[in-house]
Each structure stands twice: as structure tokens, then as C-alpha cells.
Interface confidence: low
């Protein structure tokens, strides 16, 4: 008699029990976090934690702690019920604890800058370590009122997991307060201080005459010379040098919330806005079969690209994750890991005229800094939740 458990049908360490009463002839008893007849599906189980206004429910990074919501359309709070903050200085003012607000202009429309009392030095005059912040640090959900350098930006929750994006930048210069405020602060215009968020660059943006043309020709496989500038996003990498295989060059894996019905448009928008923001060429990578390297999250391929360590058999044996995460959401939003190629050929000490992060780790710090000061979310088609840089590797030698 054939033992239905002989083929080890249960994934992720599930235990198999042969039973005549089951349609498959066996039952898998799944470990915590997995479900399905063969334990192949991740089960973030948001339970009664419901994400409103299209928000996506994500498992907590800490076992035994609440799931978190990645909110869309500017909504916030643990359940995405907090309405979007007004643009600029409001009302209500985004500056807490009697901070004074001044409006700024930027890529994402009107912004703001807070002038804060010394006792509350966060970008919105938050008080890191304030009452109610204990225990929230590092729980995966950004608590804006607990975000600031003193508390490592809510334990990295508000800065893409990077505890201190300005590490190495002299603290007395307080560049995290001045970052991307629309004014040039020479003391912050260095690699360590993240080039003052490019506030010192001229021209600051792609000229309107070129912008639409460069948008229409972004990463189309042809080098548009007029678009091959930092402020126009280096034509999405179309003009990068031919030497070296782009498949093995540096890349960024981004965990982002997008809406599948408009996925292509959103991927394009994501690549272009990040190219313009970071002043490097960025594009969605393709795999060997010519498919976009975009993977539903959670899922084995997605987590591998994000740098997660796992059982070496996971990839081959895990069923493909086709179910978007967050059955409990009331929208079509879903989590995706998007692998983006990066053209850093114009950055670095050899190109002093092109001031941009010259390695993927610095790109991550720059993105983390933007997230920390609230400058990233308004630009993107959906919340960016994590970034994993890959420095690039040499292609394997041909096996003859």
C-alpha cells in the first residue's frame, strides 16, 4: 500500500498524517504562519485588524505583535482611518508641540518645514521617547509622534528599517532637520549628510519643455541625449555604458504596495519618480525570460529578493504565491517586491558634477532619510515598506 506521506507533501515543516477521510489521503498539520492543504500558503492572518481605505494588511515583523496596515491615498493610523494630512501647513498644522510651520515647494507639491522648540526636535516637532512610545519602537508600524533621531526614527519603522540614515553626518549640523526643505545648506551638502536632499542642485528639476518628452521616452531602450541628465533621471538608464551585463549590475529590491489593475502604469511611475528623486537611472529589471522582476508579497521569490534567509528547498517546493496578501483589505491593493536596476555610472568621485549616491547602500540611506522626513510617500504610487540593496555581482563564468 502506498503511503501518501512518503512524498513529503507538506511544505514549510508541516507534519503529514495519512487519513482515509481526506480527499488527498493525507492531512498536513501546518506550523504557525502557514495554511492550505499542503501548508504552501503564507497566512499573515490579519484577523480583526482591518485596513480601511484600500490599505494592505501585512504581518508584523515581531511574532505575537499586531499586524500592520500599509495605508494608501495618504490615510494613516493603525487601521488607515486617519484622514490624509492637508498639503503644506494645513490647517491643522503638521507641526506638533507649538512648532511653527512654513510652506515649501517640491516634486510632490506643497510641503512644509517645522521650526521646533529644542525639547521636541523631530521633523514635525515630535518628542522621541514621549509617553506612549515605549514598546512601539521596531514593531513595523511607523508612529509619527515617536519618530526622530533620538528614538532612531521609531526604531527604523519610519525610515525603511534604517535606524539612522544620517549616520556619519555630524550631529551638531542637524542636517536631518534641513534635509529636503527646499533650501541649500552647504554644511549638509556631502555624501555623509546625503547631499542635503539635493537642495543645493541646479537645475533642481527637469525643465518643463523636456519633462513630458523624457516621460514619454523613459527607459524605452533608446538613449535620448536631452534626457540623459541627473534632473531628468538619466533617461531611465537607457544611456548607460554598454560595458558590463546589466543583469549583474547593482539593483534595489523594493517592497511596495500597488494596485494590480494598473500595475504597469504604477511600475513606470515608480521607476521614473525614483530616478528623478535619487538622480540615478532606475528601471524595472527583467529576468532571463524577459519578464518584469515583480513578485507578489509574501512569496518565496519576493522574500528571496528582499534578502530573507530561508530553507534552501523553499523555492522549489513552495507553491507560487498568486493570492495577493491581505484578504481582509477592502480593495485591490497588494504587496509586490519590485527589483530595479540602477545605473550608478554617472555617480561617485570620478563624476563630481553629478552628485548622487554612488552605491546601493547609500541609495537606501537616501530613501530612508526621505521616508523619515515624510518626503517619500507623497511621490510614490503606493507605500514603500522596505528596500534591500544589491551591490551587483560578476556574471558566472560560461560552463563549457
Amino acid at each position: 500500500e502506498i503511503d501518501p506521506c512518503h512524498s513529503q507533501p507538506c511544505f514549510h515543516g508541516g507534519t503529514c498524517e495519512a487519513t482515509a477521510g481526506s480527499p488527498l489521503g493525507f492531512i498536513c498539520h501546518c506550523p504557525k504562519g502557514f495554511e492550505g492543504p499542503t501548508c504552501s500558503h503564507r497566512a499573515p492572518s490579519c484577523g480583526f485588524h482591518h485596513c480601511h481605505h484600500g490599505g494592505l494588511c501585512l504581518p508584523s515583523p515581531k511574532p505575537g505583535f499586531p499586524p500592520r496596515c500599509a495605508c494608501l491615498s495618504g490615510y494613516g493610523g493603525p487601521d488607515c482611518l486617519t484622514p490624509p494630512a492637508p498639503k503644506g501647513c494645513g490647517p491643522p498644522s503638521p507641526c506638533l508641540y507649538n512648532g511653527s510651520c512654513s510652506e515649501t515647494t517640491g516634486l510632490g507639491g506643497p510641503g512644509f518645514r517645522c521650526s521646533c522648540p529644542h525639547s521636541s526636535p523631530g521633523p514635525r516637532c515630535q518628542k522621541p521617547g514621549a509617553k506612549g512610545c515605549e514598546g512601539r519602537s521596531g514593531d513595523g508600524a511607523c508612529d509619527a509622534g515617536c519618530s526622530g533621531p533620538g528614538g532612531n526614527w521609531d526604531g527604523g519603522d519610519c525610515s525603511l528599517g534604517v535606524p539612522d540614515p544620517w549616520k556619519g553626518c555630524p550631529s551638531h549640523s542637524r542636517c536631518w532637520l534641513l534635509f529636503r526643505d527646499g533650501q541649500c545648506h552647504p554644511q549638509c551638502d556631502s555624501e555623509e549628510c546625503l547631499f542635503d536632499g539635493y537642495d543645493c542642485e541646479t537645475p533642481p528639476a527637469c525643465t518643463p519643455a523636456y519633462d513630458q518628452y523624457c516621460h514619454d521616452h523613459f527607459h524605452n531602450g533608446h538613449c535620448e541625449k536631452g534626457c540623459n541628465t541627473a534632473e531628468c533621471g538619466w533617461d531611465g538608464g537607457d544611456c548607460r555604458p554598454e560595458d558590463g551585463d546589466p543583469e549583474w549590475g547593482p539593483s534595489l529590491a523594493l517592497l511596495v504596495v500597488l494596485s494590480p489593475p494598473a500595475l504597469d502604469q504604477q511600475l513606470f511611475a515608480l521607476a521614473r519618480v525614483l530616478s528623478l528623486t535619487l538622480r540615478v537611472g532606475l528601471w524595472v529589471r527583467k529576468d532571463r525570460d524577459g519578464r518584469d522582476m515583480v513578485y507578489p508579497y509574501p512569496g518565496a521569490r519576493a522574500e528571496e529578493k528582499l534578502g530573507g534567509t530561508r530553507d534552501p528547498t523553499y523555492q522549489e517546493r513552495a507553491a507560487p504565491q498568486t493570492q495577493p496578501l491581505g484578504k481582509e483589505t477592502d480593495s485591490l491593493s497588494a504587496g509586490f517586491v519590485v527589483v530595479m536596476g540602477v545605473d550608478l555610472s554617472r555617480c561617485g568621485p570620478d563624476h563630481p558634477a553629478s552628485r548622487c549616491p554612488w552605491d546601493p547602500g547609500l541609495l537606501l540611506r537616501f530613501l530612508a532619510a526621505m521616508a523619515a522626513v515624510g518626503a517619500l510617500e507623497p511621490l510614490l504610487p503606493g507605500p514603500l515598506l522596505a528596500v534591500h540593496p544589491h551591490a551587483g555581482t560578476a556574471p558566472p563564468a560560461n560552463q563549457l
Epitope: 504557525k32 480583526f48 511574532p63 505575537g64
Partner: antibody
Framework: EVQLVESGGGLVQPGGSLRLSCAAS????????MSWVRQAPGKGLELVAT????????YYPDSVKGRFTISRDNSKNTLYLQMGSLKAEDMAVYYC????????WGQGTLVTVSS | DIQMTQSPSSLSASVGDRVTITCKAS??????VAWYQQKPGKVPKLLIY???TRHTGVPSRFSGSGSGTDFTLTISSLQPEDVATYYC?????????FGQGTKVEIK
Amino acid sequence: EVQLVESGGGLVQPGGSLRLSCAASGFTFSSYGMSWVRQAPGKGLELVATINSNGGRTYYPDSVKGRFTISRDNSKNTLYLQMGSLKAEDMAVYYCARDQGFAYWGQGTLVTVSS
Amino acid sequence: DIQMTQSPSSLSASVGDRVTITCKASQDVGTAVAWYQQKPGKVPKLLIYWASTRHTGVPSRFSGSGSGTDFTLTISSLQPEDVATYYCQQYSSYPWTFGQGTKVEIK
């Protein structure tokens, strides 16, 4: 408005069987895990069975394992509890409840086990 | 299974008093703890989930705290309508388990 309505309780002899139903309305039933919780007269609350949103996973405490089966029909928005080999200690009010933090409960149905 | 041990099993306090009920888990449950109120002859009602989050419509005099193995439900100012039995519950590991209950009465 979320509503959970249990039915199927009644008097049964020891060793007998009973099937409880819970009709759900006012929310997307197929998106939520569901549970049965019981309360013996004058006693505390005890979780009897839990099922995840798609019916793929079920959980039971040792006290009912092998005797009770929880199931659901998402097309009918209905949760079931098939109880077998009933004992005197199974006598209780049986509630169906939504989620792991039971924010919503039915009014309960009484199961009496007596000869 | 994880045991949830509540104390005291019953208490009597005056209106306006601060009342504290504790719940100890036999192993670490993170913050996956809920508290319920059950009035005589009524269905249990969710008060607190994730250890400290008040459920919609629950008066602010009810608060929860704790993580790991030790949890507390506090009623800051006891009211006559708070006479009930209170239960803690863990939902960190299956099967989810309840404490044995704490009966609160007015002196």
C-alpha cells in the same frame, strides 16, 4: 450591522450527536476566521474550535479533539459545529464568534447532555 | 496549551475606586491578549485587544497594559455598570485560551 445567529442546540443523550449552525450577516464572511466558544453553567469561557477564513485550517483543544468538527460554507455565510460522542461535561451555551479577538458574538444556543 | 491565570478570582470595590485585574500567561504571548466583560445573563463583550487597544465604544476608564507574560486590565474609576466577570484571553498560539475569570462587585 454584524449579526451572528446560532441554531441547532437542544437535548441530547450522552454519546449522541448534534450539529450547530451559525448564520452570519453584515460583513464579508469569507474574509474572517471564525470560532465556537462555550460556557458551561456558572463556569468560564472555553474555546471549542477555530477555522480560518478559507476553511483550510482548523484547531481544537484536547478536550474535544476527535469528537467535534468545525466547518464553514462561505457561499452560504454559515459556520457549523458537528459534535459527536457527547458527554455530560459538554453541556453549555455555545457561541459563535468572529476573529481571534472576539469582537462579535452570537446570542448562543444551549446544548443539554442528559439521559 | 498556554495557561492564562487571572487574579484575583473575585473582588469587591467602591464606586470611584481604581480596580486592577492581572493575568499571567504560562509562556510568552507577545501582546496577543484580549480582555472581555461579561455581565450576568449577557454575551461577553470585547474591551481590549492587542493588550492595550480599546475596542470601539469602550469607555476610556478601561485600559490594558503588559507584554510577554504579565498583563493588566485597569478600571480607573469603578462605575455601578461595571459589575461583571472579566476574562483575559491569549491568541498568540493555538488553541486560544481564556483565563478563569474575575468577578467584580460593588461594596
